[in-house]
């Protein structure tokens, strides 16, 4: 049995330009200790979308549901979506260290943007 699962329940989300997109992610545990970060794309060129403690992400808001008893919610909402936001978003768990070590990624959620 896996010690930690990172779950992105939606394979894809479609949002009209100008609206907000909610990207859902849950982890089965806070252990191992370390942050969850959101990225768009994969590999060395991926774009950091949200980090709880570092950086400034004015369009991104955490929207977790703290009432979820059986897992931890790390969902985010991105406001004022534009066509440039299209892509696949990954919720990624890191193990705390110097530096933090990437441990596990969700399967990804593809965001598509419809015209207004």
């Amino acid at each position: 049995e896996e010690e930690l699962q990172v779950i992105q329940p939606e394979k894809s989300v479609s949002v009209a330009a100008g609206e907000s997109a909610t990207l859902n992610c849950t982890a089965t545990s806070l252990i191992p200790v370390g942050p969850i970060q959101w990225f768009r794309g994969v590999g060395p060129g991926r774009e950091l979308i949200y980090h709880q403690k570092e950086g400034h992400f004015p369009r991104v808001t955490p929207v977790s549901d703290p009432t979820k008893r059986n897992n931890m919610d790390f969902s985010i909402r991105i406001s004022n979506i534009t066509p440039a936001d299209a892509g696949t978003y990954y919720c990624v768990k890191f193990r705390k260290g110097s530096p933090d070590v990437e441990l596990k990624s969700g399967a990804g959620t593809e965001l598509s943007v419809r015209a207004k």
């Epitope: 049995e1 010690e3 930690l4 806070l30 252990i31 709880q52 977790s64 931890m72 919610d73």
Partner: antibody
């Protein structure tokens, strides 16, 4: 019904060792993060050690790091705390506690008393 | 380390009245919209029992006269109305960052 039953406490001299055990039942032990928390009249509740559900990751506060070792046997639904180089300040009631999400302590055992004294 | 300061250390409240316990963390315990602050009740000779998880969520089986509120560094546990079986010591606990830490406890008695 969830049950956590600690054992192994007792009186030990400073510098000595003890091994505490916690027998779990009534829940899927292998899915839970498990911890030990101790309680003293003077210091209140103090987190002592935590182990991930599969046993890969362990965490300790500086007060016990290098002296205490936490392990688990999921096949036996059991948790173990090996305590070496014991000091008078380790005297406490030791509770075994479960954490489904590695956050709040869901369930606690009744505790086992460790006394370190010459 | 995150230091948890509970107040008052003891509290005497009349039956049927409101009891309010405060807990202040030395730094924010919030992350991703969760407040990693929890409350426990401990009666003499018993282990602690989870009452409230993540600041405001009532644990299953806990009476709804218990409630929790707060965010970032300031949190409150309220018992309203206080009943005789609520006489106990109450502890706050943060799991936002290691080492996990507890408040010093608040002893609730009947006036």
């Amino acid at each position: 019904e969830v049950q956590l039953v600690e054992s192994g406490g007792g009186l030990v001299k400073p510098g000595g060792s003890l091994r505490l055990s916690c027998a779990a039942s009534g829940f899927t032990f292998s899915s839970y993060v498990m911890s030990w928390v101790r309680q003293t009249p003077g210091k209140g509740l103090e987190w002592v050690a935590t182990i991930s559900s599969g046993g890969t990751y362990t965490y300790y506060p500086e007060s016990v790091k290098g002296r205490f070792t936490l392990s688990r046997d999921n096949a036996k639904n059991s948790l173990y705390l090996q305590m070496n180089s014991l000091r008078a300040e380790d005297t406490a009631v030791y509770y075994c506690a479960s954490q489904l999400t590695g956050s709040e302590f869901d369930y606690w055992g009744q505790g086992t008393t460790v006394t370190v004294s010459s | 380390d995150i230091v948890m300061t509970q107040s008052p250390a003891s509290l005497a409240v009349s039956l049927g009245e409101r009891a309010t316990i405060s807990c202040r963390a030395s730094e924010s315990v919030d992350s991703y919209g969760n407040s990693f602050m929890h409350w426990y009740q401990q009666k003499p000779g018993q282990p602690p029992k989870l009452l409230i998880y993540r600041a405001s969520n009532l644990e299953s089986g806990v009476p709804d006269r218990f409630s929790g509120s707060g965010s970032r560094t300031d949190f409150t546990l309220t018992i309203n109305p206080l009943q005789a079986e609520d006489v106990a010591t109450y502890y706050c606990h943060q799991s936002a960052d290691l080492p996990w830490t507890f408040g010093g406890g608040t002893k609730v008695e009947i006036k």
